[in-house]
Interface confidence: low
């Protein structure tokens, strides 16, 4: 009779993580008598996956009833596959012996490859805010995918970016892989509403890529422009001076009025108006009682925005003649009155 052969008909099997792998194995003869064992890997360090004779293998089920005397199908199923299960599996026939069974013949092996989905990409921006015209870096990371082939793209508001560098680790063979990419983005004043998107495509995603996003509102700082104007006279001896703070982001802003260099009042931006581009405008105003003054007054509007060094704008208030109409009445009625008598 022809000598027993162990046939593993599948050179390779590709399974999605979490799925079940079927590893097929048939013998060509019932002789010699003895059990089958399945191993991952070959040589002395091989790992026992299933032993027909003894042991507990909760993730493994046999395809056929191995207790039947005429059974020659030793295929197994391994449940809940993870990338760590990847490797070459050998079906090995043992000959019954005393005291131990003796390895008789091995199948050619079946390579189990595991397809694992990448994790959702995580995009992170710089630790500190930057102003328009500056270049900032964003990183994107995704982990745990297999096989190694993966595609990563960057977009800003739907437009693909080209200035980025990507690495897939490790370089050699591994059960799963990670991708890390850094993109450079130039900020503009209009970027408060902008988004940076990292898009990852992988064979396991079936054409539906994963995306990670970062809002540039977390990254950008748009410094304000200031304008101090003298408004029309409200009463014979009162002048209304306004400080218009325009086009700033984020909202965190503190304004200080100085009269001839001395601090008059400090306030925090509260009732701001939002522009279409996401930046803010705010206005503060003073009612100055000019009759209490003999000399000209230098009024300074000083603004500290988002913890940055203060910027200021001054206005010289002439008290020798009656105040003339200067500037315009823009939005003055919409803000609270900050009345101040100067003595």
């Amino acid at each position: 009779e022809e000598e027993l052969q162990v046939i593993q008909p599948d050179k390779s099997v590709l399974v999605a993580a979490g799925e079940t792998a079927t590893l097929r194995c048939t013998a060509t003869s019932l002789i010699p008598v003895g059990p089958i064992q399945w191993f991952r890997g070959a040589g002395p360090g091989r790992e026992l996956i299933y032993n027909q004779k003894e042991g507990h293998f909760p993730r493994v089920t046999t395809v056929s009833d191995l207790t039947k005397r005429n059974n020659m199908d030793f295929s197994i199923r391994i449940g809940n596959i993870t990338p760590a299960d990847a490797g070459t599996y050998y079906c090995v026939k043992f000959r019954k012996g005393s005291p131990d069974d003796v390895e008789f013949k091995s199948g050619a092996g079946t390579e189990l490859s595991v397809r694992a989905k990448p994790s959702a990409p995580v995009v992170s921006g710089p630790a500190a805010r930057a102003t328009p015209q500056h270049t900032v870096s964003f990183t994107c990371e995704s982990h745990g995918f297999s096989p190694r082939d993966i595609t990563l793209k960057w977009f800003k508001n739907g437009n693909e970016l080209s200035d980025f560098q990507t690495n897939v680790d490790p370089v050699g063979e591994s059960v799963s892989y990670s991708i890390h990419s850094t993109a450079k983005v130039v900020l503009t004043r209009e970027d408060v509403h902008s988004q940076v998107i990292c898009e990852v495509a992988h064979v396991t995603l079936q054409g539906d890529p994963l995306r990670g996003t970062a809002n540039l509102s977390e990254t950008i700082r748009v410094p304000p422009t200031l304008e101090v104007t003298q408004q029309p006279v409200r009463a014979e001896n009162q002048v209304n001076v306004t400080c218009q703070v325009r086009k700033f982001y984020p909202q965190r802003l503190q304004l200080t009025w100085l009269e001839n260099g001395n601090v008059s009042r400090t306030e925090t931006a509260s009732t701001v108006t939002e522009n279409k581009d996401g930046t803010y405008n705010w206005m503060s105003w003073l009612l100055v009682n000019v009759s209490a003054h003999r000399d000209d007054v230098k009024l300074t509007c000083q603004v500290e925005h988002d913890g940055q060094p203060a910027v200021s704008k001054s206005h010289d208030l002439k008290v020798s003649a009656h105040p003339k109409e200067q500037g315009s009445n823009t939005a003055a009625e919409n803000t609270g009155s900050n009345e101040r008598n100067i003595y």
């Epitope: 008909p9 099997v13 590709l14 399974v15 999605a16 979490g18 799925e19 056929s64 449940g79």
Partner: antibody, heavy 123, light 107 residues
Framework: QIQLVQSGPELKKPGETVKISCKAS????????MSWVKQAPGKGLKWMVW????????TYADDFKGRFAFSLETSASTSYLQINNLKNEDTATYFC????????????????WGQGTLVTVSA | DIVMTQSQKFMSTTIGDRVSITCEAS??????VAWYQQKPGQSPKLLIY???NRYTGVPDRFTGSGSGTDFTLTISNMQSEDLANYFC?????????FGSGTKLEVK
């Protein structure tokens, strides 16, 4: 296209034997595993067996060992289910269902189903 | 054997509703779960495989989710043609087992 066509309804008496068939077409029969599924009237689905069409070896659910015999006629691309010593509780619709992939890649959900064969066991 | 429990035998719905059908496995099955729809007198029809993959031609109002032991089939915008029986199935280990089914009825 892929089709599984089952034999017609059967009316049997308790103690008799029934053999129903499932003929496959539109693919290579021995490349895909085949299962049989039972559905009693108004009840759920019970998986009975998976047959390795390559080796002919069946894998049974415990409830279907003994009186149930499953066989193949590969030249005719046909799978058979035979129930011996019929009992009233065997009254059900029996479906054959094919694996979705070449079974080296292992999943076992069912895309392709036969239309079902109603077996009625009544004295 | 792995027991697949569909705790709700019947669910009353309204057309346009969002419906979630749950299935619990008695032990970890990874993502080796499929969902089927069956109408009276018909064979089951595959909707979802690998827990969350929609089968070709299945409307995108059907979505599957879950892994491990807890699985959900969601119909986002219930249609009259969705009134049927729904079964989950595990194929992680032999014997393959089905849930007992959840029948969707109109209120």
């Amino acid at each position: 296209q892929i089709q599984l066509v089952q034999s017609g309804p059967e009316l049997k008496k308790p103690g008799e034997t029934v053999k129903i068939s499932c003929k496959a077409s539109g693919y290579t029969f021995t490349t895909y595993g085949m299962s049989w599924v039972k559905q009693a009237p108004g009840k759920g689905l019970k998986w009975m067996v998976w047959i390795n069409t390559y080796s002919g070896v069946p894998t049974y659910a415990d409830d279907f060992k003994g009186r149930f015999a499953f066989s193949l006629e590969t030249s005719a691309s046909t799978s058979y289910l035979q129930i011996n010593n019929l009992k009233n509780e065997d009254t059900a619709t029996y479906f054959c269902a094919r694996d979705p992939h070449y079974y080296g890649s292992s999943p076992a959900w069912f895309v392709y189903w036969g239309q079902g064969t109603l077996v009625t066991v009544s004295a | 054997d792995i027991v697949m429990t569909q705790s709700q035998k019947f669910m009353s719905t309204t057309i346009g509703d969002r419906v979630s059908i749950t299935c619990e496995a008695s032990q970890i099955v990874g993502i080796a779960v499929a969902w089927y729809q069956q109408k009276p007198g018909q064979s089951p029809k595959l909707l979802i495989y690998s827990a969350s993959n929609r089968y070709t031609g299945v409307p995108d109002r059907f979505t599957g989710s879950g892994s491990g032991t807890d699985f959900t089939l969601t119909i986002s915008n219930m249609q009259s043609e969705d009134l049927a029986n729904y079964f989950c199935q595990q194929y992680s280990a032999y014997p393959f087992t089905f849930g007992s089914g959840t029948k969707l009825e109109v209120k």
